[in-house]
Interface confidence: medium
């Protein structure tokens, strides 16, 4: 789903307050609800009628350092006989997510939010049928 | 996907540097790649064989303030005749994502990362079949 543009008031102080110095904000250490875990069916990626593979991207200066991307295995969907049915389409499900980018020069370390598009999995859809008028 | 716990070295300065004062870090204003947009097939949620609905949660002290959650409409999947086939299962696809929580007392504003579990959509899977040895 879409993340709104940040060119608004969220990261700004109230108008009656002095502005943030140096274009940076205070980010408290620690993550709220950091122990939560995704709970998904086992082998969902291979049991799906629109199966997918996973690729892990790794970047030590990104938090989280591991970002997993899904790629649909087929153009069509897998039918009850285990064959690809090209009358249906496997399509990716995408999500916008935030990561934190670390930037450092010597002992000066700063962080910046970054928007990343993640393909989370795939779903099987009926193709769009166009009626010519 | 899982987001790692933050009790490691990512948010710490190198050991040879003085520690971060007051348990906070410098977060630069602005978001890298904020103009990236999700590119998904139109009406994927209703065209899917495992269709879903969306619910929007709203929190003005969270960035993004809107978080969209999907809920599978059916236990089974929709077949070519448009009927629910309970020999297959609609299952949710989840993703861990980061949001930013805003905390303010008067003119003192700070921010903290928060992990949120988002159900992004649903996929149709074959149920687990058990072969007893």
């Amino acid at each position: 789903r879409k993340i709104p543009k940040v060119g608004h008031t969220f990261f700004q102080k109230p108008e009656s307050c002095p502005p943030v110095p140096g274009g940076s904000m205070k980010l408290d250490i620690g993550i709220i609800n950091e122990n939560q875990r995704v709970s998904m069916s086992r082998n969902i990626e291979s049991r799906s009628t629109s199966p997918w593979n996973y690729t892990v991207t790794w970047d030590p200066n990104r938090y989280p350092s591991e970002v997993v991307q899904a790629q649909c295995r087929n153009l069509g969907c897998i039918n009850a006989q285990g064959k690809e049915d090209i009358s249906m389409n496997s399509v990716p499900i995408q999500q916008e997510t935030l990561v934190v980018r670390r930037k450092h020069q010597g002992c000066s370390v700063s962080f910046q939010l970054e928007k990343v598009l993640v393909t989370v999995g795939c779903t099987c859809v009926t193709p769009v049928i166009h009626h010519v008028q | 996907r899982k987001i790692p716990k933050v009790g490691h070295t990512f948010f710490q300065k190198p050991e040879s540097c003085p520690p971060v004062p007051g348990g906070s870090m410098k977060l630069d204003i602005g978001i890298i790649n904020e103009n990236q947009r999700v590119s998904m097939s139109r009406n994927i949620e209703s065209r899917s064989t495992s269709p879903w609905n969306y619910t929007v949660t709203w929190d003005p002290n969270r960035y993004p303030s809107e978080v969209v959650q999907a809920q599978c409409r059916n236990l089974g999947c929709i077949n070519a005749q448009g009927k629910e086939d309970i020999s297959m299962n609609s299952v949710p696809i989840q993703q861990e994502t980061l949001v930013v929580r805003r905390k303010h007392q008067g003119c003192s504003v700070s921010f903290q990362l928060e992990k949120v579990l988002v159900t992004v959509g649903c996929t149709c899977v074959t149920p687990v079949i058990h072969h007893v040895q």
Epitope: N35, R37, S39 | P4
Partner: antibody
Framework: EVQLLESGGGLVQPGGSLRLSCAAS????????MSWVRQVPGKGLEWVSA????????FYADSVKGRFTISRDNSKNTLYLQMDSLRAEDTAVYYC??????????????WGQGTTVTVSS | DIQMTQSPSSLSASVGDRVTITCRAS??????LAWYQQKPGKAPKLLIY???SLESGVPSRFSGSGSGTDFTLTISSLQPEDFATYYC?????????FGGGTKVEIK
């Protein structure tokens, strides 16, 4: 066939260190979360630590946080647990366990045979 | 942390009996629950995952049910090889936690 083989256990004095290893075979090691679980003889199971497939995500039980470090070498298909500042209450059989799914949380579908750690003066 | 409370801590039963073990989580854990069997001197063995899915090779006399916070492991007809200790485990959030165990003994 999936196999997990722990080693490195033994007798150590309080305050000492020990490094456990778990050699894995029979599956794509780098794709799975791996955990350490321990069991005091005659008692129940206690999860100790977990590490993601690429090693970037690590999790610890409060009882070992700051003293134990989990790591993995995917080129050697080996999982490690570095145990420092050991205490008598760390005495247990330590099992290496494989998570049953590549993504998300999971249960443990394969376990090693265990290696015994005894902390005593 | 999520606490897992298992009951009973032990039970005596005969071959052919129907045995039920319960596990209660201190908060909702969705379907992130597993059951294990452990025999003396051996590593635990996964029986059930995702509340009710039977692990490959596990006999169908084992079944799991429940949702939210209350879960049950049922052995429909106890066999001689089923005398062991059984543990539930949640994997909804870290730290992963186990129940205290239920020892199934021969009556």
């Amino acid at each position: 066939e999936v196999q997990l083989l722990e080693s490195g256990g033994g007798l150590v004095q309080p305050g000492g260190s020990l490094r456990l290893s778990c050699a894995a075979s029979g599956f794509t090691f780098s794709s799975y979360v791996m955990s350490w679980v321990r069991q005091v003889p005659g008692k129940g199971l206690e999860w100790v630590s977990a590490i993601s497939g690429r090693g970037g995500n690590t999790f610890y039980a409060d009882s070992v946080k700051g003293r134990f470090t989990i790591s993995r070498d995917n080129s050697k298909n080996t999982l490690y647990l570095q145990m420092d500042s050991l205490r008598a209450e760390d005495t247990a059989v330590y099992y290496c366990a494989k998570d049953d799914r590549r993504i998300a949380a999971g249960s443990f579908d394969y376990w090693g045979q265990g290696t015994t750690v005894t902390v005593s003066s | 942390d999520i606490q897992m409370t298992q009951s009973p801590s032990s039970l005596s039963a005969s071959v052919g009996d129907r045995v039920t073990i319960t596990c209660r989580a201190s908060q909702g854990i969705s379907s992130a629950l597993a059951w294990y069997q452990q025999k003396p001197g051996k590593a635990p063995k996964l029986l059930i995952y995702d509340v009710s899915s039977l692990e490959s090779g596990v006999p169908s006399r084992f079944s799991g049910s429940g949702s939210g916070t209350d879960f049950t492991l049922t052995i429909s007809s106890l066999q001689p090889e089923d005398f062991a200790t059984y543990y539930c485990q949640q994997f909804n959030s870290y730290p992963l936690t186990f129940g205290g165990g239920t020892k199934v003994e021969i009556k």
